[in-house]
């Protein structure tokens, strides 16, 4: 079998949801000594980067200017050390937002509920879309999908204090082109005093985790780079598997 290098880690800097006409930044973290990185979009080569000096840099940033629906989709990256190529990274879905219209998000029975109550979010958008998405702030990887002609419902079932937080919804014109976000709806879940004070909120991985922690090797940074690679691998699997 043909020898390959370990696959790199691809991630979006700050967020994978990029407003139309704004810039996206993708990071490909490979290995010190990599002489070339390639970014692929929907299976075709999109961009190339050659780090200098290669032995001091463990990854690169790819800038995608002027985001639009043509550049929204699945990205991956590979890298090369000498003549040896790596395996392909996992796929990263890059979404363009702020397309066309703004949906309205509401919650029933209301934004203030008691632990154990059944809650349903409703996302409404009058223009042609059939898929709706609900996201909790700070958990943008955990997208709930629902279908409907003009409105979709998102039943949450009996809620706990873990459901507390701010929610937004989008209408989706395809998997990678979303509407403007709705205004946020803040869900407040109260329990009895004992439970409320003790109930931990759901552990979140804020979007700011998705920053590009690329390092220049200076000796001391070897350990940091190793920790970073391990941590990001853990984070990646948490969200995508």
């Amino acid at each position: 079998p043909k020898q390959t290098l370990p696959k790199p880690i691809i991630r979006a800097e700050s967020t994978y949801m990029v407003p139309k006409e704004k810039q996206a930044t993708l990071c490909c973290q490979g290995s010190y000594g990599a002489v070339e990185y390639q970014l692929h979009f929907e299976g075709s080569l999109f961009a190339v980067e050659r780090p200098k000096p290669p032995e001091r840099i463990n990854g690169v940033k790819f800038h995608i200017p002027d985001m639009n629906s043509r550049k929204a989709g699945r990205y991956s990256c590979i890298y090369r050390v000498g003549e040896l190529w790596s395996e392909r990274s996992d796929l990263l879905d890059l979404v363009v937002t702020e397309m066309y219209d703004t949906p309205t998000l509401s919650v029933h029975p209301g934004p203030e509920v008691t632990s154990g109550e059944k809650v349903t979010f409703y996302c409404r958008l009058d223009t042609a879309t059939s898929m709706f998405l609900l996201l909790k702030e700070g958990r943008s990887r955990d997208v709930q999908r629902s279908y409907g002609k003009v409105q979709a419902e998102f039943p949450m079932g009996p809620v706990t204090t873990a459901h507390r937080g701010s929610y937004r919804c989008f209408g989706s014109y395809n998997n990678y082109a979303w509407s403007f976000p709705s205004e946020p709806v803040k869900l407040l879940v109260t329990g009895d005093i004992e439970n409320t004070s003790l109930a931990p909120t759901d552990p979140t991985f804020p979007d700011s985790w998705d920053t590009c922690l690329l390092t220049r090797e200076t000796g001391l940074q070897k350990d940091l780079a190793l920790w970073d690679h391990t941590a990001q691998n853990h984070h990646h699997h948490h969200h995508h598997h």
Partner: nanobody, 127 residues
Framework: DVQLVESGGGLVQAGGSLRLSCAAS????????MGWFRQAPGLEREFVAA????????YSPDSVKGRFTISRDNAKNTLYLQMNSLKPEDTAVYYC????????????????????WGQGTQVTVSS
Amino acid sequence: DVQLVESGGGLVQAGGSLRLSCAASGRTLSSYAMGWFRQAPGLEREFVAAISRISGDTYSPDSVKGRFTISRDNAKNTLYLQMNSLKPEDTAVYYCAASATPSATNIYTNQYAYGDWGQGTQVTVSS
């Protein structure tokens, strides 16, 4: 936006050479990563060569590697494509394109990365 005008195309015999130029106006060329693409009749637009904004790193596909060389002169606001050992299959309209990227070193090979395009110059290689 930047305005791009290609020149230098023409009719040449197989094995010959041409040098295409792309003059930029409206904005300084150093603000853009640049590329050359070509389109033959009835075929899709094809990537030919690209150069990064500041570092001058270049990339070309195997079909033209060793024959075509992309370069830029930011002081003259001009992009070049030196084409040697031309083949009949190089016949096409050649376009230059600009990508307004903050990256000094990214090389863009995909047409969707480019926002500004010239009108094109015809290159015909006879056998």
